[in-house]
């Protein structure tokens, strides 16, 4: 229903922390550089004009949009030009251009310092001086670098955050009592970014409708005991939730999210047996626990598919009736039948079936033509399936890192014009699948490595995309979203490449690596192996095995060393020539 | 919403002519095959003959394979059945449908072959 102030019926049915949390999300979001500060003090301003029309929803300026009221607050920030540039242009129009500028100057790669933990005792001191003012340090920190981040899961991530801190900080040994559960909280979080910005992607590339596929696949695998009318509705909701999500109306979304979770926890009967646990949960854990709910068992007596989508004599009538219905009617009958494939092969399923049938209701005898459609299914399912049995297999014999490096190889050779940072990242991302996924059941395996591998891959199109310089690169991210993984695993050496020339410089080092923590190292390391590779982009395995040996042995003997600069200096260039010949 | 309205139907005398029309509408007519089947008083349907969406392809029943053309004009939206050397047996509900299709989504023309 409508509402005479917007922002008074936010403010009333969101509560004043989750209101003030998100609003500062939002601005974090759109404004990624300005401070903790000065974010702060507009969050306050609008949470006192909240209040105003909560008192008296016909005071001046209640009934402006939201967009209007804080697109007219970013706008009234000092130095907008001198510090944003074109962004500033933006203020120049009106709404909804203004609010759709903004959200195209959002930056996936801001130039910010990596987001440091402060060590356990300093880190706890101020956690007690004032949790609600460290607690906003966390929500600006992750929001400004993460400008998709989906709104309502970061207050989840904040809540964690605030009971890690409440339980570690009473303890004698915080620093051990914090660190892994920390770290646990980052690794989760910074997942649900890249998943998130894959969701932003679908919807900004290729609409509410690609979404909304999306959507019925991973519902009906969840839900498979859930009827197709339920499955839409569930579908049109979620879309709506994450539109306004990826749009920047965070208060909005979280609103209609807690709506979507009351709904499902009203409606367990017509949805599944496994949500109770998340419904007795206060409401950002249940709407966390119910995005990642177990799936509820297949019912046990479904008939075959081919009965209604190959069979049945109204194939085609049907299909002429009501396109995207009967599509989406066999993207739910196959979802739910497969828990234990990834939405997108699910979905390049359901492509490959619209395909056919576009072609064969066309002809005059449709049914000889799309008898076999299912039979032609079969390549496209053995292709991820061998894609995880390898990546696996290959991950259980070199471990995370070893793994990471041969991902690194791999997509060097593939896109050796990308810059290296990037490739590293990448990697390391890649790489960290199998940690994450060749550890699951073997049923689990599949949706969780491709579906991972897909988020990744949308997060290095996104940074290609600011400076496109591999057309290989172009060509996979300038397809459909669910032909972008299978595009990158087919892509081979980049024969087009012209080698770097070996610059000793690149491969010199001192001994402040020595000092690095661990990750820092291996970046180091991987850093120079993709620099090797686009040096020498047809190197065989051996050749590079050999070499980064070599130079690990290098590390190792000179950070022990008494005069490890010495060290350093003399045993460095002799590593390079060792390392010029072995690639020779 | 689908539509399909056939047309053409009547009495006709053993050996004469009769063309029947389907005027369709609700789907882009030009992407399906369509087809026309019959059903005889008392009998079930029987697939009379269907054509390609282009309209290059056609396919026709045994019975009535020389004396029956199928036709489409995809810029009117319409199917048609030319009949020509009619026979008793060809007496029935005529249906226009989609190409693979055995079933009546539409009212149907009665063709009646007798002297």
């Known amino acids: 229903e409508a509402h005479k102030s917007e922002i008074a019926h936010r403010y009333n049915d969101l509560g004043e922390q989750h209101f003030k949390g998100l609003v500062l999300i939002a601005f974090s979001q759109y404004l990624q550089k300005c401070s903790y500060d000065e974010h702060a003090k507009l969050v306050q301003e609008v949470t006192d004009f909240a209040k105003t029309c909560v008192a008296d929803e016909s005071a001046a300026n209640c009934d402006k949009s939201l967009h209007t009221l804080f697109g007219d607050k970013l706008c009234a920030i000092p130095n907008l030009r001198e510090n944003y540039g074109e962004l500033a242009d933006c203020c120049t129009k009106q709404e909804p251009e203004r609010n759709e500028c903004f959200l195209q100057h959002k930056d996936d790669n801001p130039s910010l310092p990596p987001f440091e933990r402060p060590e356990a005792e300093a880190m706890c001191t101020s956690f007690k001086e004032n949790p609600t003012t460290f607690m906003g340090h966390y929500l600006h920190e992750v929001a400004r670098r993460h400008p998709y981040f989906y709104a309502p899961e970061l207050l989840y991530y904040a809540e964690q955050y605030n009971e890690i801190l409440t339980q570690c900080c009473a303890e004698a040994d915080k620093e051990s009592c914090l660190t892994p559960k920390l770290d646990g909280v980052k690794e989760k979080a910074l997942v649900s970014s890249v998943r998130q910005r894959m969701k932003c992607s679908s919807m900004q590339k290729f609409g509410e409708r690609a979404f909304k596929a999306w959507a019925v696949a991973r519902l009906s695998q969840t839900f498979p005991n859930a009827d197709f009318a339920e499955i839409t509705k569930l579908a049109t909701d979620l879309t709506k939730v994450n539109k306004e999500c990826c749009h920047g109306d965070l208060l909005e979304c979280a609103d209609d999210r807690a709506e979507l979770a009351k709904y499902m926890c009203e409606n367990q009967a017509t949805i599944s047996s496994k949500l109770q646990t998340c419904c007795d949960k206060p409401l950002l854990k249940k709407a966390h626990c119910l995005s990642e709910v177990e799936h509820d068992t297949m019912p046990a007596d479904l008939p075959a598919i081919a009965a209604d989508f190959v069979e049945d004599q109204e194939v085609c009538k049907n299909y002429a009736e009501a396109k995207d219905v009967f599509l989406g009617t066999f993207l739910y009958e196959y979802s739910r039948r497969h828990p234990d494939y990834s939405v997108s092969l699910l979905l390049r399923l359901a492509k490959k079936y619209e395909a056919t049938l576009e072609k064969c209701c066309a002809e005059a005898n449709p049914p000889a033509c799309y008898g076999t459609v299912l039979a032609e299914f079969q390549p496209l399912v053995e292709e991820p399936k061998n894609l995880v049995k390898t990546n696996c297999d290959l991950y259980e014999k070199l471990g995370e890192y070893g793994f990471q490096n041969a991902i690194l190889v791999r997509y060097t050779q593939k896109a050796p014009q990308v810059s290296t940072p990037t490739l590293v990242e990448a990697a390391r991302n890649l790489g960290r699948v199998g940690t994450k996924c060749c550890t699951l059941p073997e049923d689990q395996r599949l949706p969780c490595v491709e579906d991972y591998l897909s988020a990744i891959l949308n997060r290095v199109c996104l940074l290609h995309e600011k400076t496109p310089v591999s057309e290989h690169v172009t060509k996979c991210c300038s397809g459909s979203l669910v032909e972008r993984r299978p595009c990158f695993s087919a892509l081979t050496v980049d024969e087009t490449y012209v080698p770097k020339e070996f610059k000793a410089e690149t491969f010199t080092f001192h001994s402040d690596i020595c000092t690095l923590p661990e990750k820092e190292k291996q970046i180091k390391k991987q850093t120079a192996l993709a620099e090797l590779v686009k040096h020498k982009p047809k190197a065989t395995a051996e050749q590079l095995k050999t070499v980064m040996d070599d130079f690990a042995q290098f590390l190792d003997t000179c950070c022990k060393a008494a005069d490890k600069d010495t060290c350093f200096s003399t045993e460095g260039p002799n590593l390079v020539t060792r390392c010029k010949d072995a690639l020779a | 919403k689908v539509q399909l309205v056939e047309s053409g139907g009547g009495l006709v005398q053993p050996g004469n002519s009769l063309r029947l029309s389907c005027a369709a509408s609700?789907?882009?007519?030009?992407?399906?095959?369509m087809g026309w089947v019959r059903q005889a008083p008392g009998k079930g349907l029987e697939w009379v003959s269907s054509?390609?969406?282009?309209?290059?392809?056609?396919l026709y029943a045994p019975s009535v394979k020389g004396r029956f053309t199928i036709s489409r004009d995809n810029s009117k939206n319409t199917l048609y059945l030319q009949m020509n050397s009619l026979r008793p047996e060809d007496t029935a509900v005529y249906y226009c449908?989609?190409?693979?299709?055995?079933?009546?989504s539409s009212q149907g023309t009665l063709v009646t072959v007798s002297s």
């Open positions: 054509i390609s969406g282009s309209g290059s392809d056609t």
């Open positions: 609700g789907f882009t007519f030009s992407s399906f095959g």
């Open positions: 449908t989609f190409a693979g299709s055995l079933s009546r």
